[in-house]
Interface confidence: low
Amino acid sequence: IWELKKDVYVVELDWYPDAPGEMVVLTCDTPEEDGITWTLDQSSEVLGSGKTLTIQVKEFGDAGQYTCHKGGEVLSHSLLLLHKKEDGIWSTDILKDQKEPKNKTFLRCEAKNYSGRFTCWWLTTISTDLTFSVKSSRGSSDPQGVTCGAATLSAERVRGDNKEYEYSVECQEDSACPAAEESLPIEVMVDAVHKLKYENYTSSFFIRDIIKPDPPKNLQLKPLKNSRQVEVSWEYPDTWSTPHSYFSLTFCVQVQGKSKREKKDRVFTDKTSATVICRKNASISVRAQDRYYSSSWSEWASVPCS
Amino acid sequence: RAVPGGSSPAWTQCQQLSQKLCTLAWSAHPLVGHMDLREEGDEETTNDVPHIQCGDGCDPQGLRDNSQFCLQRIHQGLIFYEKLLGSDIFTGEPSLLPDSPVGQLHASLLGLSQLLQPEGHHWETQQIPSLSPSQPWQRLLLRFKILRSLQAFVAVAARVFAHGAATLSP
């Protein structure tokens, strides 16, 4: 058993046949010594008396809010949550496996630049009685600070018969060094509580591996005289690290016909312009990637040829 | 060529070669993004590689003030990786394919280190840890880890030379 936060405790249970469970001793936070009784949740049934209560926690029915009282007055609360290890594996029931980039990926994170700021998100099908708290650090043995905000519901989607809820959180490394080569990964820890079930999820990554620039901005076409060619120009996204002579991007320019089946013409360039042939009804798209490290491409920025 | 003690390197040449190094490092191990090698236990494997750290002066401001600190650090790393790529880890079984980019990568690391430090000048170099994996699968894992780490190192070096070529070239 360990304390998650004030008056909230997590009991780690081997979810096993005939498992004896965990013996837990609760102590009433009061100077009083006698006349103390204990109840669980909304029930008025007295579970025991005295300053301490010893319980055997085996099932969810044994978890919940234990309250000690004296003469009708509430003295203190202890909320017991269960963390299940089932068949040798900690339960991961609350979050959905996103399966990208590999199985058992519950948290996904992205950064728009090297400033030490990143966003993580996760999915669940649970709509109520759900809380999350997020902690992060750089390295684990001698952790350096990363500050995370509160997790918020960022999207709702309908998937078949189910509703899916996306939560996200923004974090910022306290003393980021954008130009350095990371040697210790960022660790992100999410505590999830659904009703009386506790679970924790972790992710470990280098910022360089989760970089995904915003799409290029101000994408413009300039027709070239007496030619089917156009000059496409664009700018670095505002959110990308500066100076651009140091934090450089490379770009992919694509000409795509109306039909998905039509052959795509692609040009790769380090410049912020390119000359391409603009076909009727086609569109021109440009995306960006770190020039020196193959992390994710940005989403496409597009303009129609016409 | 760089002459330790203050004169500038051939920024543009260094820029071109370091960008080539980036391309080669990724072609030598392209699927690296799909493997979480940190799960495989890092023990002594790549902990001892020289990293370009915050105080090494490789940021734009540090390069403007005095690029020598940073160039020395990059040189140290290049020599370190050049030795690793020429070691038993890469030359032993399972042998690399004949067209593997590792050979080119090895030669380019040497080329860039020589651009930074002509013969006759000596910056202090870092000792290579003695990594002699006994099993072929351990060697394979070590190669992945070294290439992974090299990708991060040469990315920073390429940024340094690109910025130097754009802003510090005479």
Epitope: D14, W15, Y16, P17, D18, A19, E59, F60, G61, K85, E86, D87, G88, I89, S91, T92, D93, I94, T125 | -
Partner: antibody, heavy 114, light 112 residues
Framework: EFQLVQSGAEVKKPGASVKVSCKAS????????MNWVRQAPGQRLEWMGV????????TYNQKFKGRVTITVDQSASTAYMELSSLRSEDTAVYYC???????WGQGTLVTVSS | DIVMTQTPLSLPVTPGEPASISCRSS???????????LNWFLQKPGQSPQLLIY???TRASGVPDRFSGSGSGTDLTLKISRVEAEDVGVYYC?????????FGSGTKLEIK
């Protein structure tokens, strides 16, 4: 008293599907994972997958690559295992087993034959 | 997948004599929490398997104390101190340290 009661024997043709049920009683159905295990004649036991009845989350043995689907009906305290694209090697006794494998159903014989 | 190798395949025993079944795992079943995630089952003819031992050495309820489990993370043993006629059947080891859970090939215990 804890009990897991499975549906009766089935005979199927190759290429068909079979759905075996497992009704639980005597305990809180949603509190315990349900595993499915099969045993071909004279062979070792083979774990097929597991479901958490509370959330419907599943983990499958990749050997059955998309052929197995485990579901539950919470209101009926029943777990189901469906195996599709049957072949003769799928002839086996299929068992459901509660978390920790302390309680097993009586088994359902599925025969695949043309 | 973790491979469980069980020996012997067949074990003829005289009632009252001890018996020992071995199970070797291709990967350690010992977790950081100090527990070894291994089960032993007995399957009597025409019956479902019954759990004898879990967490390598803990007897399931109702299992006689003549059955005991021991071992390291990879080499596991089931011992019966004095075999009785009712102990005949096929004994299986099973790892539940990681998915997919896997079983040994079984050891058939028969009375001499």
């Amino acid at each position: 008293e804890f009990q897991l009661v499975q549906s009766g024997a089935e005979v199927k043709k190759p290429g068909a599907s079979v759905k075996v049920s497992c009704k639980a009683s005597g305990y809180s159905f949603t509190d315990h994972n349900m595993n499915w295990v099969r045993q071909a004649p004279g062979q070792r036991l083979e774990w097929m997958g597991v479901i958490n009845p509370n959330y419907g989350t599943t983990t499958y043995n990749q050997k059955f690559k998309g052929r197995v689907t485990i579901t539950v009906d919470q209101s009926a305290s029943t777990a189901y295992m469906e195996l599709s694209s049957l072949r003769s090697e799928d002839t086996a006794v299929y068992y459901c087993a509660r978390r920790g494998f302390a309680y097993w159903g009586q088994g359902t014989l599925v025969t695949v034959s043309s | 997948d973790i491979v469980m190798t069980q020996t012997p395949l067949s074990l003829p025993v005289t009632p009252g004599e001890p018996a020992s079944i071995s199970c070797r795992s291709s990967k350690s079943l010992l977790y950081k929490d100090g527990k070894t995630y291994l089960n032993w089952f007995l399957q009597k003819p025409g019956q479902s398997p019954q759990l004898l031992i879990y967490l390598m050495q803990t007897r399931a309820s109702g299992v006689p104390d003549r059955f005991s489990g021991s071992g390291s993370g990879t080499d596991l043993t089931l011992k019966i101190s004095r075999v009785e006629a009712e102990d005949v059947g096929v004994y299986y080891c099973q790892q539940i340290a990681e998915y997919p859970f896997t079983f040994g090939s079984g050891t058939k215990l028969e009375i001499k």
